[in-house]
């Protein structure tokens, strides 16, 4: 597995010697066009850690989830926040640290013996109970290998895109997540405006395939903001 390779004592493929400093903090890096990082001292910490702006949990580290930093705050600013430990309050699975999941608003341990039953129960849960159902598992690798022995075909229930066969991604469908086709050139795609609206999509689309990006359709440039159609287009 990924973790066993990373944690093994195998000598990694090291680069040729670098000609200077290891990091380049001075390099300007953009998260996405037109997105500004939260500035000032508001999110700065003593070690100059700058939070990472995000639109979904999958973009964050394995021990993080994506949310607004202030409770009930500006939905337009979402950053990667540290996951919540056992017995802490939660609203969805992704908020809980690896090895835990969200049950009745509290992070609880993913006991291996009943975990699969919980997953199946979660898939059939009503929308009002847990808005994101399987979101958290898209990035929790702890137990997923026990559940998926073969790559899922189109329509198979999944936890993350790596559970799906080539050419498919794991996307929300009603209140579970299933393998759907990666979008081809000309197909309609979803361009998130990073306002948190992705969390409400119950029919989530896959991303655009290799060499394609989600852009406004040429003849829709003049249309009003709300009716702009995005399609997968060549870079």
């Amino acid at each position: 597995t990924l973790n066993s390779v990373l944690n093994s004592n195998a000598i990694k493929n090291l680069p040729p010697p670098l000609g200077g400093a290891a990091g380049h903090p001075g390099s300007a890096v953009s998260a996405a066009p037109g997105i500004l990082y939260p500035g000032g001292n508001k999110y700065q910490t003593i070690d100059n850690y700058q939070p990472y702006p995000c639109a979904e949990d999958e973009e964050c580290g394995t021990d993080e989830y994506c949310a607004s930093p202030t409770r009930g705050g500006d939905a337009g600013v979402q950053i990667c926040l540290a996951c919540r430990k056992r017995r802490k309050r939660c609203m969805r699975h992704a908020m809980c640290c690896p090895g835990n999941y969200c049950k009745n608003g509290i992070c609880v341990s993913s006991d291996q013996n009943h975990f699969r039953g919980e997953i199946e129960e979660t898939i059939t849960e009503s929308f009002g109970n847990d808005h994101s159902t399987l979101d958290g598992y898209s990035r929790r690798t702890t137990l997923s290998s026990k559940m998926y022995h073969t790559k899922g075909q189109e329509g198979s229930v999944c936890l993350r895109s790596s559970d799906c066969a080539s050419g498919l991604c794991c996307a929300r469908h009603f209140w579970s997540k299933i393998c759907k086709p990666v979008l081809k050139e000309g197909q309609v795609c979803t361009k998130h405006r990073r306002k948190g609206s992705h969390g409400l999509e119950i029919f989530q689309r896959c991303y655009c395939g290799e060499g394609l990006s989600c852009r406004i359709q040429k003849d829709h440039h003049q249309a009003s903001n709300s009716s702009r159609l995005h399609t997968c287009q060549r870079h």
């Epitope: 290891a22 973009e59 790596s162 991303y207």
Partner: nanobody, 129 residues
Framework: EVQLVESGGGLVQAGDSLTLSCTAS????????MGWFRQAPGKEREFVAA????????HYADYVKGRFAISRDNAKNTVLLQMSSLKPEDTAVYYC??????????????????????WGQGTQVTVSS
């Protein structure tokens, strides 16, 4: 054995385009960020572009923004760097690298050389004026 192999380098004229390719073998890299760095003679290795594990996020250094585009195909374990409007100052050895998804991520994660565990041997790009 894990290997990253770059290809596509060469000698081009200023203003031309070039596409570099990086093929990974020995493991799957779908939970890794893939990046391109470059090193000109007598200079430090510098960040060029990166694409995250989630495929939806790309990152570019200011000096290549709008000219270079990074993409990846997890099924084929390949990463592409499409370079256009090349300048003489883009001349360097270009390295492909892979950084594991961290527990915590910060703005500078993708541009920090030391976060990358696996590196290719590099491909030379020379842009003549």
């Amino acid at each position: 054995e894990v290997q990253l192999v770059e290809s596509g380098g060469g000698l081009v004229q200023a203003g031309d385009s070039l596409t570099l390719s990086c093929t990974a073998s020995g493991r799957t890299f779908d939970n890794y960020a893939m990046g391109w760095f470059r090193q000109a003679p007598g200079k430090e290795r510098e960040f060029v572009a990166a694409i995250s594990w989630s495929l939806s996020r790309t990152h570019y250094a200011d000096y290549v923004k709008g000219r270079f585009a990074i993409s990846r195909d997890n099924a084929k374990n390949t990463v592409l760097l499409q370079m256009s409007s090349l300048k003489p100052e883009d001349t360097a050895v270009y390295y492909c690298a892979a950084a594991p998804r961290p527990k915590r991520i910060s703005v500078s994660y993708f541009s920090t050389t030391s976060n990358y565990d696996y590196w290719g041997q590099g491909t030379q790009v020379t842009v003549s004026s």
